[in-house]
Interface confidence: medium
């Protein structure tokens, strides 16, 4: 043992323990020899605060008095300085400074499981920054009582490790916490319980949920519980949402009849428990259960469009194209598209399943009336069939909206207005809004996109599969009956300078004026729809400006004759391309001499 | 009962670092205080850091403050001392030791590193520094 006093001691009155703002006194006293050699009025006792001087004293004790002590530990060391050699410690003493324990507060005990044990909880109040013992007591029926002692810094919970048994629900238990230290002790206010008050039950466990005869309206969740549980509460919700259903049942006996659940939807389940109707509290819920409920046949109807293409003089190409049922139409896993193709006069019908794919292109005659009707099938059933008579969409041109335009509106959106037809307006039973990327080969495989719009709508907001920089082939039909007109236009959400001209490929000459081909500027690089191309050309060698020519764009044009250039002339020519946002850089450049005669 | 093991020493450059571990067990460990005190040969015992686990306050011997650092793992009952930059004079027996809360009140906000409150002590661990 290291004997850290053997030169002096260091007393304290009136304690080592003091209440927060008393004073203490400090003695620090050497033992005989143990002073400085030759003199000891020499000795000069220095008390140090931790590493801080605050008193000295020239011969054999110091006496101090301090006051101001912070709640906590404060060391006290005393040394001695003797002439010409370094401080030697003497003695030290620690001084805690702490308050009497507060009441305990808001004292509660509970049982976790009619086989658990009892444990309490309080509030300990303010740190006292001493020692402090926490008495848990419990007193029962027939005089008996449990004991527990706590000697945690920060004890605010005791197990008693006994079990109450429901044998008297009705009996009463009083517990009460006391808490001592060395300044004073303080005792929690009584608190009374049966067992039905602190039994709280474990979780439901075991839960599992079964459908009858594979249907989503014959459905049973069963569960496990502890055997004196009265009440359950389940919850459940999707699993994609965030709110829960709730139901509240009494003496279920482990299981409940649910008739609200949505097909093909993945559920999370929980249960909670309790043992009396007004007493004790609920169980934790359960750990969650998820399932899946079975499918049910398809609701709703699939919104079908279609596009018809000329091939030859008896025979024309039919696309149908369909969207997807929302979730909650489709009730389960669409596992194939019926399409039936009929022949109105003749009753000819064909049959079709398409899986994979939301369209399908046939060739039929161009001669009859032609009708479809698509449907979606689940396991359980089909959707109802969407019916459409195949017409000519656009043969009436009274029915043809006016004034169409297209106008980008934010980021990836057109906004596509129009005016109502010249025809009675009141006979338009929809409009559709059909918009496709445009491909200057009138690519078919290019996917579709519609929208359907009310009658007396004149415009529409166009935001699925929109792509910056792309042009788009906007149709607006108007469908009454049997009959229907369309207008279309061009239109893009953003645009900007096309990245490169138009590639002329041939100047060809016919009879005194030329005619220029060119290749089509690659999609991705037209940035927007083109208004107009530029032919420019001017004398080889010449620094005189270009004269130019401008056509307006059209989607097939790929070829345009000039006549005024001069025979024997050589001349460089080349192209340019614009969108609303500028010109494109200059294409190739070729070298043409016009070979006829001069006017 | 009351065991405090020391581990960690061994022989290091000037300027290298160690860390020293204390393990700790057979008393209520978050109410205690826990240091770390060195001898050197022929010195007395002296202070070097202190901690209180309940609390996490930390106390240091000035000729350490700023290289060496007091650190605890309340799950494994166990303190540290990361020495860093050490000297030749840092040269000594390293011993971990414990105040139980009983003998010395909470220890409070603040353990301190004076000898006689310290009940509890190990074995030691050997440090050697060497230019």
């Known amino acids: 043992k290291i004997d850290a006093c053997k030169r002096g001691d260091v007393t304290v009155k009136p304690s080592h323990v003091i209440l927060l703002g008393s004073t203490v006194n400090i003695t620090c006293s050497l033992k005989p020899r143990q002073g400085c050699f030759h003199y000891s009025r020499r000795n000069k006792l220095i008390l140090y605060k931790f590493d801080r001087r605050i008193n000295f004293h020239h011969g054999h004790s110091l006496n101090s008095q301090v006051t101001g002590l912070p709640l906590g530990t404060t060391l006290f060391v005393c040394k001695l300085a003797c002439i010409n050699s370094d401080e030697i410690q003497i003695c030290g003493a620690e001084i805690f400074v702490g308050v009497a324990p507060e009441q305990p507060q808001n004292l509660s005990c509970i049982q976790k499981g009619e086989q658990g044990t009892v444990a309490c909880t309080w509030e300990r109040g303010r740190d006292t920054h001493l020692y402090t013992e926490y008495t848990l007591q419990l007193s029962g029926p027939k005089n008996l009582t449990w004991q527990k002692q706590c000697k945690d810094i920060y004890c605010d919970y005791l197990d008693f490790g006994i079990n109450l048994t429901p044998e008297s629900p009705e009996s009463n238990f009083t517990a009460k916490v006391t808490a001592v230290n060395s300044l004073g002790s303080s005792s929690s206010l009584p608190s009374t319980f049966t067992f039905l008050d602190i039994v709280r039950p474990l979780p439901p466990w075991d839960i599992r949920i079964k459908f009858q005869k594979a249907s989503v309206s014959r459905c049973t969740l069963y569960w496990r519980d502890e055997g004196l549980v009265l009440l359950n509460r389940l919850r459940y919700r999707p699993s994609n949402s965030r709110l829960w259903n709730m139901v509240n049942v009494t003496k279920a006996k482990g299981r409940h009849d649910l008739l609200d659940l949505k097909p093909f939807t993945e559920y999370e389940f929980q249960i909670s428990s309790k043992l009396h109707l007004y007493k004790g509290s609920w169980s934790d819920w359960s750990e969650s259960l998820r399932a899946q409920t079975p499918e049910e046949e398809p609701t709703g109807m699939l919104d079908v469009w279609y596009m018809k293409r000329h091939i030859d003089y008896s025979r024309q190409q039919i696309s149908l194209f369909w969207k997807n049922l929302s979730v909650s139409e489709a009730r389960g896993k669409i596992l194939h598209y019926q399409v039936t193709l009929q022949e109105l006069t003749g009753g000819k019908a064909m049959t079709q399943n398409i899986t994979g794919h939301t369209s399908w292109t046939t060739v039929i005659p161009r001669t009859g009336n032609w009708a479809v009707a698509v449907s979606a099938a689940n396991s359980k059933g089909s959707s109802l069939p969407t019916r459409i008579n195949i017409m000519n969409l656009c043969e009436a041109g009274l029915l043809a909206p006016r004034q169409v335009s297209a106008n980008s509106e934010g980021m990836d959106n057109i906004l596509v207005t129009w005016q109502p037809p010249r025809k009675d307006p009141s006979a338009v039973q929809e409009y559709v809004v059909e918009w496709r990327e445009l491909h200057p080969g009138g690519d078919t495989q290019v996917p579709l996109n519609w929208l359907r719009s009310r009658p007396y709508n004149v415009s529409a907001l166009i935001s699925e599969n929109i792509k910056s920089y792309i042009c788009y082939e906007i149709r607006v039909y108007a469908l009454s009956g049997d009959q229907g007109g369309c207008s279309s236009i061009l239109g893009n959400s953003k645009h900007k300078a096309p990245l490169s001209g138009p590639h002329i490929n041939a100047i060809t000459e016919e009879k005194g004026s030329i005619l220029i081909s060119w290749n089509s500027i690659p999609v991705q690089e037209q940035m927007g729809c083109l208004l107009h191309y530029r032919i420019y050309w001017k004398e080889r060698d010449s620094n005189s400006q270009p004269q130019l020519c401008e056509i307006p764009y059209r989607v097939s044009q790929n070829s345009h004759p000039i006549n005024s250039l001069q025979p024997r002339v050589t001349y460089v020519l080349w192209m340019t391309a614009l969108t609303a946002a500028g010109e494109s850089s200059h294409g190739n450049e070729r070298e043409f001499c016009l070979q006829g005669k001069a006017n | 009962q009351v065991q405090l093991q020391e581990s960690g020493g061994g022989s290091v450059q000037v300027g290298g670092s160690l860390r020293l571990s204390c393990a700790a067990s057979g008393f209520t460990y978050s109410s205690s205080c826990l240091g770390w005190f060195r001898q050197a040969p022929g010195k007395e015992r002296e202070g070097v850091a202190t901690i209180y686990p309940a609390g996490g306050n930390i106390f240091y011997a000035d000729s350490v403050k700023g290289r060496f650092t007091i650190s605890q793992d309340n799950a494994k009952n166990t303190v540290y001392l990361q020495m860093d930059s050490l000297k030749p004079e840092d040269t000594a027996m390293y011993y971990c030791?414990?105040?139980?809360?009983?003998?010395w009140g909470s220890g409070g906000n603040r353990c301190s590193l004076w000898l006689p409150a310290y009940n509890y002590w190990g074995q030691g661990t050997q440090v050697t520094v060497s230019s």
């Open positions: 030791a414990a105040r139980g809360g009983q003998t």
